[in-house]
């Protein structure tokens, strides 16, 4: 009986490694075989691999690659998911505060208007929220509806409180008169301009963040091609077939393979860079009338000024409307005009704040700075993945896809691959349909971001002046002016108290890529939302 072969002449190590990938050893040869059926790990001599093993290696390699890609994008993905949730909630808080301020203004100054005013204000701010979230609502219509609804109440409760109930069917006429007679002066137009500009920008900002998430989710879940699977197998696993268990791929070789595998993904790079820079431009312009926090939290003051404007012109208006809407006046007009100092209740309208607290605009700038550190994310992916997977340092004594070499030479590796398949072919196939779709979406959002980017510096004031409104003397420091013109303007330091907890308002379980099926998490809410 011949002596048993020495350990390295058996496939013992390969068997024990493969056992971890695929329990059961029926596919692993006991001793090296010719391997004439192999298609990827083409043998230069006897091999410890079989065709079935190759297939398993290919599957494992592709899965491995998907995991590497997902871990590469994890930090970026969390950054955007987290901030999209944070800003959405923060914007909702701003809307809620703005509604409360406006209601407080009515309650303190015009208690007789409150039940109806609260209702109209509520509807207006509900529409504001829906618009920010992408609803197809016209901002001008929202503002018109607010003033159309308010005027009949102001007229019947404040300007003409003696009007008999029977005359209350003049509401429709009063709504029409509101526009025809411009009873609120230029204030509705001022509000339309400010609200539409600030909300448009807010809406596109949120849309852009959500698209960022979609881009990463798309590339995170790319299925790599069979060709790529073969290249990865050759790089990561074919060395095992020769019993070389400890050898690592050459770094240069890894870069070539990754560039081939990721050619489609890297095409996103140009549009991703533009996306981050366009988003930065948008954020830089989100101040004053382009900052919803500033605009919405000042609305109560502008609405208040508009009612004062009506009251100042009450005498003239009552006569004109009396004729226009033909109601019999029971008694002489009595203006319910209050002295100036009652108008702004500083106690109620004061916003709680802490020194140096975080504002939304600083939070936005912080996000952009963090995003900019990922500007080369897609072009750097091949290199990143190679640096986060086992490769030989300095390319010495490493695996080049066919054999153990002292030094990696791209030319030699290419020559050796000629008969296997063409790396260039892999690159020329062009991006996958899903990548093409996401590129189209990025192009579209970049276009939108560019058209929305704000004019800089004094141009902003000039634009406002051309529309016939006072641009005011508010500086661009942290004390932003709130409100429109008139004496009702107050200053609020750092309008929104930006709670630290908001920074973690993240429901990761709703993010794709979670494989825990048995968990009752559908429509669950994060603790940090509550």
């Amino acid at each position: 009986q011949p002596p048993p072969p020495p350990p390295d002449a058996t496939c013992h190590q390969v068997r024990s490694f493969f056992q971890r990938l695929q329990p059961g050893l029926k596919w692993v040869p006991e001793t090296p075989v010719p391997g004439s059926d192999l298609q990827v790990c083409l043998p230069k001599g006897p091999t410890c691999c079989s065709r079935k093993m190759e297939e398993k290696y290919q599957l494992t390699a592709r899965l491995n690659m998907e995991q590497l890609l997902q871990s590469a994008s994890m930090e970026l993905k969390f950054l955007i998911i987290q901030n999209a949730a944070v800003f959405q909630e923060a914007f909702e808080i701003v809307v809620r505060h703005a509604k409360n301020y406006t209601n407080a203004m009515f309650k303190n100054n015009y208690p007789s208007l409150t039940p109806q005013a609260f209702e109209f204000v509520g509807e207006f701010f509900t529409d504001v929220s829906l618009y920010i979230l992408g609803s197809d609502i016209n901002v001008d219509d929202m503002v018109n509806e607010l003033f159309d609804s308010l005027f009949p109440v102001i007229y019947t409760q404040l300007m003409n409180p003696g009007l008999p109930d029977s005359a209350l069917d003049i509401n429709e006429c009063l709504r029409g008169a509101r526009r025809d007679l411009k009873v609120f002066g230029n204030f509705p137009k001022l509000i339309m301009t400010q609200v539409s500009k600030s909300l448009q920008v807010t809406r596109i900002f949120l849309q852009a963040l959500n698209l960022g998430i979609e881009v990463i989710n798309t590339t995170d879940h790319l299925k790599f091609s069979k060709d790529c699977g073969r290249m990865l197998t050759r790089m990561w696993y074919c060395s095992y077939c020769q019993g070389l268990m400890m050898v690592k791929p050459c770094g240069g070789y890894c870069n070539v393979v990754m560039q081939g595998c990721m050619a489609g993904v890297v095409e996103i790079d140009k549009y991703w860079r533009e996306y981050i820079l366009s988003l930065e431009e948008l954020v830089n312009g989100m101040y004053r009338i382009y900052d919803m926090e500033n605009v919405l939290l000042g609305l109560f003051s502008t609405i208040h000024d508009s009612i004062q404007y009506v009251q100042k012109n009450a005498g003239k208006l009552t006569t004109t409307i009396g004729k226009l809407c033909a109601h019999s006046q029971q008694r002489q007009y009595r203006s319910a005009y209050y002295p100036e100092d009652l108008f702004i209740d500083k106690k109620v309208l004061k916003v709680a704040h802490v020194e140096h607290e975080e504002t939304l605009s600083s939070r936005r700038r912080e996000l952009i700075q963090k995003l900019k550190s990922f500007i080369s994310f897609y072009s750097a992916l091949p290199g990143y993945i190679c640096s986060h997977s086992p490769v030989a340092e300095n390319d010495t004594l490493c695996w080049n896809g066919q054999e153990l070499v002292e030094r990696y030479s791209q030319k030699a590796a290419r020559n050796g691959m000629k008969n296997q398949f063409n790396l260039h072919e892999l690159k020329m196939k062009g991006p996958e349909p899903v990548v093409s779709q996401i590129i189209d979406k990025l192009k579209h959002i970049n276009q939108l971001l560019r058209t929305m980017s704000m004019p800089k510096g004094r141009v902003l004031d000039k634009n406002l002046d051309e529309e016939g409104f006072e641009s005011g003397d508010c500086g661009d420091d942290e004390d932003e002016c709130i409100g429109g013109s008139g004496d009702g303007m107050i200053k609020v330091k750092n309008q929104l108290r930006f709670l630290a907890e908001l920074a973690y308002d993240l429901d990761v379980d709703d993010a794709p890529g979670n494989s825990q099926q048995a968990t009752p998490k559908d429509n669950e809410i994060s603790t940090f939302h509550n």
Partner: antibody
């Protein structure tokens, strides 16, 4: 499968601190909030707070603010709760549990505060 | 904080009987997304609580269909259609919508 392995029972002196650990196995640690719950015969089950290991975000029950500090180590997939200035009131079984709906709980750690 | 009130404190039953446990919250547990975040757990002596029902009426995987949950807003009920020996222990309701999350005081299901 999903498992939460908690550290062993602790006997501590009043005024001291203790750090309990909860190792997560069988799921992506950074994807799920980890919550901590206290159980005593007198007060029953009480929610202490939560940490999101992915972002480091925390939420606390006001009652336990200053008493409990939640941390997480992404690399070892382990959540920690440190309890400080211990008194006999803090003697209890402490559970870590994985949100959502607390489908998975650790086996509990008994903390006894005694001189 | 939201107070969760469970009744009865103790529920003696015979095996095969139906058992009903009630839980009332001091505030509505309906979220703006339409879901109601109310769970039921069973804890046996020396063990951790085990999830039975989530979001009022959804049985967790592996929970026998003799367990059912119902209710809305602030009033909830856990029913066990035919009590078996393995069902004995303390049942807790729990709300996870208002921070701090809160548990009911527990109902002990025991043999008559």
């Amino acid at each position: 499968q999903v498992q939460l392995q908690q550290s062993g029972a602790e006997l501590v002196r009043p005024g001291a601190s203790v750090k309990l650990s909860c190792k997560a196995l069988g799921y992506t640690f950074t994807d799920y909030e980890m919550h901590w719950v206290k159980q005593t015969p007198v007060h029953g089950l009480e929610w202490i707070g939560a940490i999101h290991p992915g972002s480091g975000g925390t939420a606390y029950n006001q009652k336990f603010k200053g008493k409990a500090t939640l941390t997480a180590d992404k690399f070892s997939s382990t959540g920690y709760m440190e309890l400080s200035s211990l008194t006999s009131e803090d003697s209890a079984v402490y559970y870590c549990t994985r949100y959502y709906s607390y489908a998975y709980w650790g086996q509990g750690t008994l903390v006894t505060v005694s001189a | 904080d939201v107070v969760m009130t469970q009744t009865p404190l103790s529920l003696p039953v015979s095996l095969g009987d139906q058992a009903s446990i009630s839980c009332r919250s001091s505030q509505s547990l309906v979220h703006s997304n339409g879901n109601t975040y109310l769970q039921w757990y069973l804890q046996k002596p020396g063990q951790s609580p085990k999830l039975l029902i989530y979001k009022v009426s959804n049985r967790f995987s592996g929970v026998p269909d003799r367990f059912s949950g119902s209710g809305s807003g602030t009033d909830f009920i856990l029913k066990i259609s035919r009590v078996e020996a393995e069902d004995l222990g303390v049942y807790f309701c729990f709300q996870s919508i208002h921070v701090p999350y809160t548990f009911g005081g527990g109902t002990k299901l025991e043999i008559k």
